[in-house]
């Protein structure tokens, strides 16, 4: 097995990626400028910390979380970084074009970088379902399509349903999950004989995946509060997210032990279930009025996540060709739905408490918003999957799925690992 990049990809990837980067640089040159009105530099430097937290989540958290494959850990981390870097650039431009362009220039602020990082995070969640089965050229396509689809979804939801930044960005969990699952469904599924070991996890990569989970766990409150507009809402979001993820860790570890006949704890369950509370609480994190509610939500989310990790991989592996350790897709799809349902319940309580008959209308709109997110995710995911199947991308052969040696130079290694 040659450790060289296939010839065609070696020709295609640098040309494709560098041409795209040159195009992005030109777009930035002609259409963007920095916000020049920085009166209070000290305050703005402080607000950069939220953006920094998001970058840590994306680069280290999601980068390492997806690195548990025995023979695909390098690619997981580095490809994640590549997608993040590309995704942020395109997301800044796209958000600017969609929201500011009538004025002729896109003004880049710390907030626009924050938004762009969160948009790029969507791709990093989705890609968990396809990592190891695609090359970098294909991932570039996935980044461009998904960031574009999410940007347009957010714009449509904002205009039709009158939602703010936080609300329309919190559809990211459901959107990213369904996008990733629909892309995975389009890709070639069967693993030929003799390659099954490659999608198994190994101890050291699993440890790095746990490190990724820890980073995500630590910074999830920043993610859920990043787009909220007032200190009191942010405070609520941080507290509720913290309580939810704290309880989901306890639930994940004990639930994982409970689910095993010998009472052993599964690394895979824990990797994803520790984050369950943060996903489930995301949409309504600023609204939940007391800690016990956030904790109950964390408990329920942890149980759903462990249950899902136990019973869904078989189905996902058969139908979508997603390996057992890539459980972020179905995990986020279930937990994202749970979060949306909780929000709808809170909306109903608010309407009932206000004492008028608008409940059906409010619920209908919320369901419409959620349905739109899922439909756009599925449609754009299927479109991406079809695009990725085109011969021009020279996708890795099924026999070379989940193999770092297809993409990386390992001077100290022989042909095999």
């Amino acid at each position: 097995m040659s450790s060289k990049y296939p010839r065609s990809v070696r020709r295609c990837l640098p040309l494709w990626a560098l041409t795209l980067e040159a195009a992005l640089i030109l777009l930035f040159y002609f259409f963007t400028h920095y916000d020049a009105s920085l009166e209070d530099q000290k305050g703005l430097v402080a607000s950069y910390q939220v953006g920094q937290d998001l970058t840590v989540m994306a680069a280290i958290g999601l980068g390492f979380l997806t690195s548990s494959f025995r023979r695909h850990s390098w690619s997981s981390v580095a490809f994640n970084l590549f997608m993040l870097a590309l995704g942020v650039q395109w997301a800044i431009l796209l958000d600017g074009f969609l929201s500011q362009f009538p004025s002729g220039k896109v003004v880049i602020t710390l907030f626009s970088i924050r938004l762009a990082t969160m948009s790029a995070l969507s791709v990093l969640i989705s890609v968990d379902a396809v990592l190891g089965k695609v090359n970098l050229a294909q991932l570039v396509v996935m980044v461009l399509v998904e960031v574009t689809a999410l940007g347009n979804l957010r714009m449509v939801i904002s205009n039709i349903f009158n939602t703010d930044y936080h609300m329309n960005m919190m559809h990211i969990y459901v959107f990213a999950a369904y996008f990733g699952l629909s892309v995975a469904w389009c890709l070639p599924k069967p693993l030929p004989e003799g390659t099954e070991d490659k999608d198994q996890t190994a101890t050291i990569p699993s440890l790095s995946a746990m490190l990724g989970a820890l980073f995500l766990w630590m910074f999830w409150p920043s993610f859920n509060s990043a787009l909220l507009r007032s200190p009191i809402e942010r405070k609520n979001a941080v507290f509720n997210t913290y309580y939810a993820v704290a309880v989901s860790v306890v639930t994940a570890i004990s639930g994982s032990s409970l689910a095993h006949p010998q009472g052993k704890i599964s690394k895979t369950y824990v990797h994803s279930a520790v984050l369950a509370g943060g996903v489930a609480v995301g949409t309504s994190c600023h609204l939940i009025p007391s800690p016990w509610l956030a904790m109950v939500l964390g408990l329920v989310a942890g149980l759903i996540s462990v249950g899902g990790a136990k019973y869904l991989p078989g189905c996902c592996n058969r139908v979508l060709g997603i390996p057992h350790s890539s459980i972020m897709g179905y995990n986020f799809s279930l937990l994202g739905l749970l979060g949306e349902i909780i929000y709808i319940v809170l909306l109903v309580l608010d309407t009932v408490g206000a004492g008028n008959g608008m409940i059906g209308f409010q619920v209908l709109l919320s369901i419409g918003e959620l349905s739109l997110a899922i439909v756009i995710a599925l449609m754009s995911g299927l479109l991406t999957g079809l695009l990725l199947n085109l011969k021009i991308w020279k996708a890795p052969h099924e026999a070379k799925y989940f193999d770092d040696q297809v993409f990386w130079k390992f001077p100290h290694l022989a042909v095999g690992f």
Partner: antibody, heavy 125, light 106 residues
């Protein structure tokens, strides 16, 4: 006592620039979103711009996008509105307003609970 | 969301019950505020979150509604209530105001 005091208004020619200030006192300025709202002679109120409590984000009405810039200096408890390429239709009384966020039954609600007295900007040749 | 107020103007007597309506083009939940504006003064907040009375506002003012239809009611009109009344949505940017209802005392 909460006070908002606008200044910097006056008569200016079309195409020129003007900078409005709003000095805040009596509350913790750095924890509130601040807005500019205007009222043209004989017309209704029109929202102009907002800046978030930490200055990280700004939003503008379509009519002023690309020409007006809102900013704040939390260390000086001051809000600003830089108005460039002024037009006759920008003639109005400009108010700064504080946005307070309050809990409804469950959802959060936003209200302009304090306003300044306004400063008149006249764009005329 | 565009806000349409009605009526454009109205004239009523002291002691009358007056109702002003505001209709939104989109669902704005309960994020609607009502202001009273007198010439030469700053606008004054009367009702926020559709039905909550702002501190210091007389109890004759009340608000109701949710979603797209809202009303401001003055239960017993007083001479000092002569002013222009605006509704305003604060759910999403750009914030918008209704065109105003001018209330005169007969």
């Amino acid at each position: 006592e909460v006070q908002l005091l606008e200044s910097g208004g006056g008569v200016v020619q079309p195409g020129r620039s003007l900078r409005l200030s709003c000095a805040a006192s009596g509350f913790t300025f750095s924890t509130y979103g601040m807005h500019w709202v205007r009222q043209a002679p004989g017309k209704g109120l029109e929202w102009v711009a907002v800046i978030w409590f930490d200055g990280s984000n700004k939003e503008y009405a379509d009519s002023v996008k690309g020409r007006f810039t809102v900013s704040r200096d939390n260390s000086k408890n001051t809000l600003y509105l830089q108005m460039n390429s002024l037009r006759a239709e920008d003639t109005a009384v400009y108010y700064c307003a504080r946005e307070e966020v309050v809990r409804g039954v469950i959802l959060w609600s936003r209200k302009f609970d304090y306003w300044g007295q306004g400063t008149l900007v006249t764009v005329s040749s | 969301a565009e806000l349409t107020q009605s009526p454009f103007s109205l004239s009523a007597s002291v002691g009358d019950r007056v109702t002003i309506t505001c209709r939104a083009s989109h669902n704005i939940y309960r994020s609607l505020n009502w202001f009273q504006h007198k010439p030469g003064e700053a606008p004054k907040l009367l009702v926020y979150a559709a039905s909550s009375l702002q501190r210091g506002v007389p109890t004759r003012f009340s608000g109701s509604g949710s979603g797209t239809d809202f009303t401001l009611t003055i239960s017993s009109l007083q001479p000092e209530d002569s002013a222009t009344y605006f509704c305003q949505q604060s759910v999403t940017f750009p914030y918008t105001f209704g065109q105003g209802t001018k209330l005169e005392i007969r």
